[in-house]
Interface confidence: medium
């Protein structure tokens, strides 16, 4: 056996909706061989599941095996390194990974102009992986709500509209003109999950878009 | 009619903070957009913050840069300015002012649209 190699520090879960990352911190001096065994478990089914033998990045996307993450009681997931025949002891995630770990993310958010109001539009995330019936508004039915930060560009300010309970928001500009820059932070009432703000989507506002009214 | 009455100022060394007060009176305080504006000496009056009458929406100057937080108390007719991380510039008269309307809109960092001041308090950031 030789000297047993040391265990991976930390294995933890970054996920998004449908996006279900098990990141690791690489063990000390690991060698060009070293590899990482990836074991999954599903909460209710006490069995450890090899996913992945010999894995040499620092991350595995589990996407595809914790499908159903949002309709059970979720998942443990181990690692351990593997070099040669020698391998380390399993390091398993502190927590439990399940819906309340998903970092809510909004998929884009569109604006318009009229009539001298700004008109966003959130867009839910759509992702590839997700089965036909599993939407974010079927998963996340009630009290989705969203974070709004609005600048100006060039301006003296920025502002954020801390609750829209929907997915529509409005925002009238008071004669204001120039560019309005928008970004969107998702969270359910009800739930304790973060959220992530949406990169910032910009519209321009001159003159043309006021209409005059007697 | 709102009367508005703020407090908190003092002097305070750079990085510290500082919490202003503003106690309104009158019975409509809770339906009124209110917020804190400042004027530095020899200079024109600047926007700080506003927080609509339901505390939904806060609106900041660029220079605040989060060191800021506003929020108020319905329930005890007064308003809150959160100061961290301050600076020799943010030495100024603070005032607290309220406005009318409640529509999620850009009127509230303007000056004008603010029909209710208070007499200010003195904040003076200095080593």
């Known amino acids: 056996h030789g000297t047993e190699l040391p265990s991976p520090p930390s294995v933890w879960f970054e996920a998004e909706f449908f996006h279900h990352i098990l990141h690791w911190t690489p063990i000390p001096n690991q060698s060009e061989s070293t590899c990482y065994e990836v074991a999954l478990l599903r909460y209710g089914i006490e069995s450890w599941n090899s996913i992945s033998n010999c894995s040499q990045t620092l991350s595995y996307d589990l996407t595809a095996v914790t499908l159903d993450l949002y309709h059970s009681n979720g998942y443990r997931a181990r690692v351990r390194a593997v070099d040669g025949s020698r391998h380390s002891n399993w390091t398993v995630t502190n927590t439990r990974f399940s819906v309340d770990e998903v970092t809510l993310t909004v998929g884009s958010v569109n604006l318009e102009i009229h009539n001298g109001f700004i008109l966003g539009k959130i867009q839910l995330p759509r992702p590839k992986m997700a089965p036909a019936n599993d939407t974010y508004e079927s998963i996340f039915s009630h009290f989705r709500e969203y974070e709004i930060a609005i600048r100006k560009v060039p301006g003296n300010f920025t502002f954020t509209h801390k609750k829209v309970k929907h997915e529509n928001f409005s925002l009238l500009t008071s004669g204001e003109v120039g560019e309005f820059c928008v970004q969107v932070k998702p969270s359910v009432a009800s739930r304790s999950n973060k959220g992530m703000w949406s990169k910032e989507e910009c519209i321009s506002l001159t003159r043309q878009y006021f209409t005059v009214t007697n | 009619e709102v009367q508005l009455l703020e407090s908190g100022g003092g002097l305070v060394q750079p990085g510290g903070s500082l919490r202003l007060s503003c106690a309104a009176s009158?019975?409509?305080?809770?339906?009124?957009?209110v917020g804190w504006f400042r004027q530095a000496p020899g200079k024109g009056r600047e926007f700080v913050a506003a927080?609509?009458?339901?505390?939904?929406?806060?609106y900041f100057g660029d220079f605040v840069e989060g060191r800021f937080t506003i929020s108020r108390d319905n329930s005890k007719n007064t308003l809150y300015l959160q100061m961290n991380s301050l600076r020799a510039e943010d030495t100024a008269v603070y005032y607290c002012a309220a406005a009318t309307g409640q529509v999620w809109s850009l009127q509230y960092l303007r000056e004008s649209s603010y029909a209710y001041w208070g007499q200010g308090t003195l904040v003076t950031v200095s080593s």
């Open positions: 009158g019975r409509t305080f809770s339906s009124h957009t």
């Open positions: 927080i609509t009458w339901n505390g939904d929406t806060t």
